[in-house]
């Protein structure tokens, strides 16, 4: 067997000769011979090859199926595949982005730490002391409790991670 390094990186060995691979965006039609160079042809519409290759068929561009919540983020070329992303309010279920799921909402008592993107889900965090969230939302952060003091009011009901404090008037001492 021939040593694997007999030909250069963008070549392949066939019939005791180092033939050029086809460049990205092109497929192999015929191997080189002593009299001819490797014959390559450009990939057709909606096809691609992204490496120097000896493939006889180009790959089909990925289809971003709207029925799966997908849309085109970047159109494919003869050298690159189409990149799909998810419709607004949805995110990919995997790195390959073959389908989408609805963004998760953060329950009451939790706020949004990081808003979801086309490729990542919502990240929620528990509302710490002094903060609350009383809604289920994919956008709302934890809100700080109302400061009764700044309104010249007093706390009538303590806040929780799900409810704001309730402020009321200060008791007046009778004369």
């Amino acid at each position: 067997p021939e040593p694997p390094t007999a030909c250069r990186e963008k070549q392949y060995l066939i019939n005791s000769q180092c033939c050029s691979l086809c460049q990205p965006g092109q497929k192999l039609v015929s191997d080189c011979t002593e009299f001819t160079e490797t014959e390559c042809l450009p990939c057709g519409e909606s096809e691609f090859l992204d490496t120097w290759n000896r493939e006889t068929h180009c790959h089909q561009h990925k289809y971003c199926d709207p029925n799966l919540g997908l849309r085109v983020q970047q159109k494919g070329t003869s050298e690159t595949d189409t990149i799909c992303t998810c419709e607004e309010g949805w995110h990919c279920t995997s790195e390959a982005c073959e389908s989408c799921v609805l963004h998760r909402s953060c329950s009451p008592g939790f706020g949004v730490k990081q808003i979801a993107t086309g490729v990542s889900d919502t990240i929620c965090e528990p509302c710490p002391v002094g903060f609350f969230s009383n809604v289920s939302s994919a956008f709302e952060k934890c809100h700080p409790w109302t400061s009764c003091e700044t309104k010249d009011l007093v706390v009538q009901q303590a806040g929780t991670n799900k409810t704001d404090v309730v402020c009321g008037p200060q008791d007046r001492l009778r004369a």
């Epitope: 030909c7 070549q11 005791s16 000769q17 009299f35 490797t38």
Partner: antibody
Amino acid sequence: EVQLVESGGGLVQPGGSLRLSCAASGFTFSYFPMAWVRQAPGKGLEWVATISTSGGNIYYRDSVKGRFTISRDNAKNSLYLQMNSLRAEDTAVYYCTRDTAPYYFDYWGQGTMVTVS
Amino acid sequence: DIQMTQSPSSLSASVGDRVTITCRASQDIGNYLNWYQQKPGKAPKLLIYRATNLEDGVPSRFSGSGSGTDYTLTISSLQPEDFATYYCVQHKQYPLTFGGGTKVEIK
């Protein structure tokens, strides 16, 4: 490491002959087409001839056709250029180089000087 | 035969300059173009093959572009070791033809 070493250059009278050799090492010589490229003193590069892997396909520049013969001996890892009917305009440094797609002239020898005077 | 017209034939530049050299073919050569660097008394060295591909070991400040008949070699930030003569060559068809060369000199 790929190495190409030319020899056989020298001073020759117009109408004379010379045979250049190129010893190849560091790669499988028989897998690669080879070529000669020359450079006249103070001038640019000029392709002279190319030979296919087993010698069945050969190309020459018009000005050397019928006077120069490129050949190879794969068993000896050697490339040759037989130069007859030499003219003053053939004076140049002659380089041996690999002519392999998609890189083409990827490795070169140090050159050998041919002076026709 | 395919004629290769290289310009400029010479240029003066300073270290750090961006340098552009062009090669024009007399007919479409479909990216079958290489660029070489040659220093005095030395053999040429391959820089770029098939118009845009950087040869192994060549610094990334060198780049090639173009298509059809017009091709460009760019040195993004000229270094002291880049002062040399640069040649293009077409490999589309025989006879293989070189451009006349561009000598890059220190300003």
